[in-house]
Interface confidence: low
């Protein structure tokens, strides 16, 4: 006989990512005896909450909380019962709620209070429901990506922790209502609001981050729709042969389309809008989203926002990944270079509705919007953030790393549960439980 080492006890953490279009629940796990090790926290399971994001329940706050129940019931099953009381539970809301908080702060408070009431009914260690700032969303996405890819520290074969020489990855997140760019930079930011100083594992990181509200995929599509109604009476980014009834109240209810809102419009009026498959007009429409006219700093990305030159490799996730994956997988188009990405966007925008449906059978939802989405991603990366061909070569489009979704949720939990220490780890020996 020989002694058999028991596998270590696991700890769990739950994050509800309350995005603008939907809510996702992520359950993370890690060995209790290795809490400060890097790359040790992984995704245990996930659950997509049915229905829209919690911000869509502004008129029905209790509906927001009720929508979460299915996933919370799943969490009761996924986390061992004896671990329930010690499992932290967080809800973080992003740009959808930031927008609601701007237009109707009472409604956003009511939604959060309703959600809080429901979350406290569960046996987990509920630690709050709150709206993340754009900076948080960007930085926690960056932390997640670099934690999962073990860019902070790594355990070497000689039994020592060391900082890998490859440096950190930049992170680009394209949500439904905002987009974030975050990367390590050597020089101080000219706009201090865009700089975050981090101390992780005894290393100091100076990080540039900026979140562009209203530049998430869904809000961009709404803004393009408003522009198309305003300037063309048809939609150059939609495929020819595609037509739909547009409810004006839906188009203009967002603060993101406020600037395009006609002075006197009937919110219950419906307008018929048709696509024209015009890549050049579509490109012009998308270009109108970016302003390069004034910059109060030595250099800017767009809209007068300071940004140092993009440096190093980047991981682009969420809708960046979905858009590029559609071009690559569904359309079979190469997207390895910026030129190819632009050509792919033009290709999609040239397709008629019939051609698009034949090429991508069974994917009706949002199919008409992929031209605008692809054109926007291409313009945001090249003109907006200033990626040239060389820099673009260092961008990987990824949904997961180490079987864990890349997004702000893991980084948020790591921070709030102090799973990334500021101090460097001592000389520790690893224990293999395999």
């Amino acid at each position: 006989t020989r002694d058999v080492r028991e596998p270590p006890a696991l700890k769990y953490g739950i994050v509800l990512d309350a995005g603008s279009s939907h809510t996702s629940m992520f359950i993370y796990k890690w060995p209790a005896d290795k809490e400060n090790d890097t790359g040790i926290v992984g995704q245990h399971s996930s659950c997509d909450v049915p229905g829209g994001g919690i911000s869509s329940y502004a008129d029905n706050p209790s509906g927001a909380s009720q929508s979460l129940v299915g996933c919370l019931e799943q969490a009761l099953q996924d986390v061992p019962k004896e671990r329930h009381a010690g499992t932290p539970l967080y809800l973080g809301a992003t740009a959808g709620m930031r927008l609601l908080n701007l237009t109707n702060p009472e409604a956003s408070t009511s939604v959060l209070m309703a959600v809080t009431h429901t979350l406290t009914q569960y046996p987990f260690d509920f630690r709050g429901a709150r709206i993340l700032s754009g900076q948080e969303e960007g930085v926690f996405g960056w932390v997640t990506a670099n934690y999962l890819l073990e860019n902070f520290i790594k355990y070497g074969w000689v039994g020592r922790w060391f900082r890998p020489r490859k440096g950190t990855l930049g992170a680009m997140d394209l949500g439904g209502a905002s987009t974030q760019i975050t990367f390590e930079t050597t020089s101080p930011a000219e706009d201090r609001a865009s700089e975050v100083q981090l101390h992780l594992y005894g290393q100091h990181y100076r990080v540039y981050t900026h979140s562009f509200l209203c530049y998430g995929r869904d809000q961009v599509l709404q803004r393009l729709l408003a522009s198309a109604l305003q300037t063309h009476g048809f939609h150059p980014c939609w495929p020819r042969g595609f037509s739909t009834q547009v409810l004006l109240g839906d188009v203009y209810q967002s603060p993101c389309t406020m600037a395009q809102r006609p002075q006197n419009f009937n919110s219950s009026a419906r307008v018929s809008l048709s696509g024209s498959s015009d890549p050049h007009l579509c490109r012009d429409l998308v270009s109108g989203l970016f302003s390069f006219s004034s910059c109060p700093f030595s250099r800017c990305s767009f809209n007068g926002v300071f940004q140092p030159p993009v440096a190093g490799n980047f991981v682009a996730f969420s809708a960046f990944f979905y858009t590029v994956d559609f071009l690559r997988t569904s359309m079979g188009l190469p997207v390895a270079t910026l030129q190819q990405l632009e050509a792919a966007a033009v290709n999609v925008c040239n397709q008629t509705w019939a051609q698009l449906q034949a090429r991508v059978p069974g994917q009706r939802a949002r199919l008409a919007d992929y031209c605008a989405g692809a054109m926007f991603v291409q313009q945001l990366l090249s003109r907006g953030y200033g990626f040239d061909e060389r820099a673009f070569g260092g961008v990987i489009f990824q949904k997961k790393a180490a079987d864990t979704a890349v997004g702000w949720a893991l980084g948020y939990m790591l921070n709030l549960t102090n799973l990334i220490p500021a101090d460097p780890p001592g000389l520790r020996k690893g224990t293999d439980f395999s």
Partner: antibody, heavy 125, light 106 residues
Amino acid sequence: QVQLVQSGAEVVKPGASVKISCKASGYTFTDYNMDWVKQAPGQRLEWIGDINPKYDISTYNQQFKGKATITVDKSASTAYMELSSLRSEDTAVYYCARRGFFLYYGINYYYFDVWGQGTLVTVSS
Amino acid sequence: EIVLTQSPATLSASPGEEITLSCSASSSVSYIHWYQQKPGQAPRLLIYSTSNLASGIPARFSGSGSGTFYTLTISSVEPEDAAVYYCHQWSSYPWTFGGGTKLEIK
């Protein structure tokens, strides 16, 4: 330098209203939220509410909803707080405070970095 | 709402002495700020985000803590430190303050 100058002391009768002001200087008024805090004699400080001058959006502590109304005049870089239906328990020093923030680890940590000198409101018949 | 309880309510110290003021939260908070208020004056920011010294505050002041328990330490008390010290949480709405600790100098 950054300064918040509040209006002078007020003595008001029960049931009346009072509007106190807080003039900001030395910084861009619309870049920071302005909060109001109550300090009643022998009591702890209580947060009343705040206003975002850029968007004219105010948020209140539930306890002060209906009691306090916070507004701004952007052109005058001035925040106001009106207290209505005054009672003896509203007797207190009221402070305006600028909501500063410190960005660390991606989180905006808010705090009150500059305070007005305070306005004493006495409710007495 | 989160209730912050400060102890002791009053503290008497001699110049040069090291003292510690505590602030206990009714449930976990992410960070705490500390303010100093002298008689007839408005509160003044002392320490923000648990341990960061505000501009112009002497290095003898320091803060630490996490979760539900936070402390403010004055390493060598000076006569001008006589004041009421308040802790303040901004983790959970509505934002709340502690009841204060009054520091008297012997």
